[in-house]
């Protein structure tokens, strides 16, 4: 109610002898501030004086003035919120109850703290989950109700007696709900830590034992096996019997059944701790465990490998590859089932012994036609000796061997004949399904393995075949040899060597790429004029006027060939030079004259040059020479030169006269 | 050295006759490799070749298609100059006026080109 | 008679090279080996820097060079100088009636 005074702090504190305390407290006063503060070990009230009787611990008044007996007991709140206490070292005889005797300004209240001090070190609480399985991770809490800032201690886990190596998580509480320290460990027990002893030990700041608890783990687990076989080495002959026993080493809790597993398949109708096998067969060979179950699961013991040897079996050969390629690799693997393995093969080709093959694996790194056939083998072991199996078939494919091209028409061939060819093969696997050509054209294939070609070509020198199966083999080529007229003929200048000159020896030759036969025969022309048989055509100083458009004509046996017309180009320097003048030789002073320089050359004159009747050059270097306006004193002989790349030409004197205009002659 | 100094009116009215002259030193206008020339420079016509004389065994003049009916060189061998006459003259003619020698031979090769320059006359055209 | 055709502008650094174009007819560049080019600074009278294609008159720098194929001249100026900016024409002899033409001019920059 709104009468009372109220505080918090733990409603009883734990220490032992020697230790200290620290109360952790907070208080909230009905009115004003603490004025006066006295701590009473065991307060009783008197109600003759109404005051408390019993052992004052601490007093401080108004004054502020402390006895100085009171230093083992320290108040460390203050006037308003905090009374948070302090007695070190704490002793025996402080047990009992605290009572905290607080005035303000009007009012007065007495709050009761219970301190229970033993005379040695209480022993810490471990906690453990109420169930512990093997390989879970587990907390393990040890808890004890101590804390005080002037007596530092540690908590240490042990297990049978040794530090943990796990990393324990300590935590401290002094608040005015708990005081306490705590240690916790994560922890995944296996089943060996099961029925050991667990102990947590508090030890003060130096590492001194102070007290302990203990617990034993009880660490539930599926149950541990061992497996034991006679005979020992689980090897045995068939018709041999076989004894598997199987021990419990631990279990939490008991365990429940038993059974037995063959390569993890359990096995019916065998419940008991021994397993017994009589005149075993090969098929009883594998992978043998016991499973021994508890509440918690089931627990398997080690694997044993259980062999029964036998003779090999009856051989299978498998090939990799077949069809093989010739050329290719191939490797052939006997295979049968036998135990121990076998140590010796025997191998057979088309069911003829292959000497000196005496592996599980044959290699033939290049494999030939012949190789083809049925291959088998027989495997031997210290038992005996396997039976040869069924075989297998090799089928080694190959390119068409020793292909031809045939031509099947009389010789020799002329251009333009029809041509017919065909295409043959020795031997072939698989069967030749399609043939090829070359050259490629558009000829065609009247049956498989023939080719006609119509209109054969001049160029037509070679035809080759192939006959194709997966693969083409080509024959060599077989020639055509066939015969043409002439071809490519063209006229070349072979003098001079650069352009032809007036005056030059000039010599032209009629060339062609190739004929057949050989054997030809020239004609030269100019205008449909024959001018020479011979290969060559010669001029001993050549003119401008043999300028012109000249052919050549190449026969032989089987037709002639003429070459495109050739121009001859002579190049001469400017000739026939002559200036005219327009609109005439006489014109009128003022008006326009116009001089024109007029010349043949080859190539066409590229400068020209003007002189006057003193030869002075006059400065223009156009073809037309333009006076306006003219003046009488213009008159006179005026000559032009013309230049090109060969040379200079120059033209005779032509006289320009310029005679006054009507208006001059009015003037004089 | 050869030097051409130009001299004659900046400013011209319509329609009136513009007059300028061209005096050479360091060459005699009587050379028979050389041809004076009258050139002008304006933003809407850039550089444009008027006309030229020159003297061989007589006096010889060509004129630009576009001015020819309204233009004429004359010259003077006693002062050793020549001078531009541009009749009927309009806003149009207003430009840079240039008098400009070209010589015709490059040691025994022909050759063309304005080797030597005036400094330049600015003619306005305006009334 | 149409002016020669020349790029209106042309740009480069100190010490790179820069070529300018001169297009023409067979009439005039095309015919004639008589192609000259002037270089004038702002207010001068122009200056003669190639003539005949590709001559330089004493005292230009062999910096200057001058081609010509077909109908279009070229100037090429290598090792780019502040000093060059300016303006550039091309000229050439022609066959008509107006014995010379110029071109439209190429203003030079040298970027700093």
């Known amino acids: 109610d709104s009468s009372k005074w109220v505080f918090e702090h733990p409603e009883t504190l734990y220490a032992w002898e020697g230790a200290c305390v620290w109360i952790p407290c907070t208080y909230r006063a009905l009115d004003g501030d603490l004025e006066s503060f006295i701590l009473f070990h065991n307060p009783e009230y008197n109600k003759n004086t109404s005051k408390f009787d019993g052992t004052r611990l601490y007093e401080s008044t108004k004054d502020g003035k402390v006895p100085s007996e009171q230093k083992r007991v320290q108040f460390l709140g203050d006037k308003n919120k905090n009374c948070t206490l302090s007695i070190h070292p704490v002793h025996l005889n402080d047990s009992g109850q605290l009572g905290l005797r607080m005035e303000s300004k009007t009012e007065k209240w007495m709050e009761r703290i219970h301190l229970n001090v033993s005379e040695r070190p209480f022993p810490p609480h471990i906690q453990l989950p109420p169930e512990i399985q093997e390989s879970q991770e587990v907390t393990l809490t040890c808890l004890l109700n101590f804390s005080c800032y002037g007596y530092p201690i540690q908590l240490q886990w042990l297990l049978e007696g040794v530090p943990m190596r796990q990393a324990a998580v300590t935590s401290t509480s002094l608040t005015i709900k708990s005081v306490f320290t705590r240690s916790e460990l994560k922890f995944s027990p296996q089943w060996s830590h099961h029925g050991k002893i667990v102990t947590c030990q508090l030890q003060d700041a130096d590492g001194k034992f102070l007290s302990n608890d203990t617990v034993q783990l009880n660490v539930k687990h599926t149950p541990k096996l061992e497996i034991k076989v006679t005979p020992s080495d689980a090897i045995v002959r068939e018709g041999d019997s076989v004894t598997m026993t199987c021990e419990v080493s631990s279990s939490n809790p008991e365990y429940t059944t038993v059974s037995w597993l063959k390569d993890g398949t359990s096995l019916k109708k065998q419940n008991t701790f021994t397993l017994n096998l009589r005149e075993v067969t090969k098929d009883q060979s594998g992978k043998y465990c016991c499973q021994v179950s508890n509440d918690v699961g089931p627990g398997r013991s080690e694997e044993v490998f259980l062999q029964v040897q036998y003779a090999p079996e009856p051989s299978t050969v498998q090939i990799l590859h077949s069809p093989a390629v010739e050329g290719s690799q191939v490797e052939f693997l006997c295979m049968s089932l036998a135990n121990p393995l076998p140590t010796n093969y025997t191998w057979y080709h088309n069911g003829k012994e292959m000497q000196g093959r005496t592996e599980e694996k044959v290699h033939i790194p290049k494999i030939l036609p012949w190789h083809a056939g049925t291959y088998s083998c027989v495997a031997e072991n210290i038992l005996g000796t396997g039976q040869r199996g069924p075989g297998a078939e090799l089928d080694v494919q190959y390119p068409p061997k020793k292909v031809t091209t045939v031509i099947q028409n009389p010789m020799p061939i002329r251009e333009g004949d029809t041509v017919t060819l065909s295409c043959n093969y020795n031997s072939s696997n698989p069967s030749v399904t399609r043939y090829e050509w070359k050259p490629h054209g558009a000829w065609e294939e009247p049956s498989l393995g023939v080719l006609k070609i119509q209109n054969v070509g001049w160029d037509n020198t070679t035809i080759a075949c192939a006959a194709c199966n997966s693969w083409c083999s080509w024959a060599s080529p077989v020639a055509l040899n066939v015969q043409y007229a002439p071809r490519d003929v063209r006229v070349r200048k072979i003098k001079p060597l650069s352009e032809i000159h007036s005056g030059n020896s000039v010599s032209l030759q009629c060339d062609f790429s190739s004929s057949h036969p050989k054997e030809v025969q020239f004609f030269w022309e100019k205008n449909g004029r024959l001018l020479g048989k011979e290969s060559q055509l010669n001029f001993d100083s050549i003119s401008p006027e043999d300028a012109g458009s000249y052919s050549c004509w190449v026969n032989n046996s089987i037709g002639q060939t003429a070459s495109k017309a050739w121009t001859l180009e002579v190049l001469y320097a400017p000739r026939r030079l002559r200036v005219s003048m327009s609109p005439g030789d006489q014109v009128m002073e003022g008006k326009s004259a116009t001089l024109t320089c007029e010349s043949d050359a080859n190539p066409p004159v590229s400068h020209y040059t003007w002189f006057d009747w003193n030869n002075q050059s006059l400065p223009y270097h156009s073809q037309k020479l333009r006076l306006e306006p003219v003046k009488v004193q213009h008159s006179g002989a005026y000559w032009c030169q013309g230049t090109n790349s060969v040379g200079k030409g120059r033209s005779p004197l032509s006289t320009l006269t310029v005679y006054y205009s009507p208006e001059t002659i009015g003037r004089r | 050295e050869v030097q051409l100094q130009q001299s004659g009116p900046g400013l011209v009215k319509p329609s009136q006759t513009l007059s300028l002259t061209c005096a050479i030193s360091?060459?005699?206008?009587?050379?028979?490799?050389?041809?004076w020339n009258w050139i002008r420079q304006s933003p809407s016509r850039g550089l444009e070749w008027l006309g030229r004389?020159?003297?061989?065994?007589?006096?010889?003049?060509d004129y630009a298609s576009s001015v020819r009916g309204r233009v004429s060189i004359n010259v003077d061998t006693s002062k050793n100059q020549y001078s531009l006459q541009l009749n009927a003259v309009t806003p149009e003619d207003t430009g840079v006026y240039y008098c400009?020698?070209?010589?015709?031979?490059?040691?025994?090769?022909?050759?063309?080109?304005?080797?030597?320059w005036g400094q330049g006359t600015m003619v306005t055209v305006s009334s | 008679q149409s002016a020669l055709t020349q790029p209106a502008s042309a740009s480069g650094s100190p010490g790179q090279s820069v070529t300018i174009s001169c297009t023409g007819t067979?009439?005039?560049?095309?015919?004639?080996?008589?192609v000259s080019w002037y270089q004038q600074h702002p207010g001068k009278a122009p200056k003669l820097m190639i003539y005949?294609?590709?001559n330089r008159p004493s005292g230009v720098s062999n910096r200057f060079s001058g081609s010509k194929s077909g109908n279009t001249a070229s100037l090429t100026i290598s090792g780019l100088q502040a000093e060059d900016e300016a303006d550039y024409y091309c000229?050439?002899?022609?066959?008509?009636?107006?014995?010379?033409?110029f071109g439209t001019g190429t203003q030079l920059t040298v970027l700093t």
């Open positions: 005949d294609v590709s």
């Open positions: 360091g060459d005699s206008m009587l050379s028979n490799s050389d041809t």
């Open positions: 004389t020159y003297h061989r065994s007589t006096w010889y003049d």
């Open positions: 067979s009439s005039d560049v095309g015919g004639y080996n008589y």
């Open positions: 400009a020698r070209v010589r015709l031979q490059d040691g025994n090769s022909w050759s063309d080109a304005f080797d030597v």
């Open positions: 000229s050439s002899y022609t066959s008509s009636s107006t014995l010379y033409v």
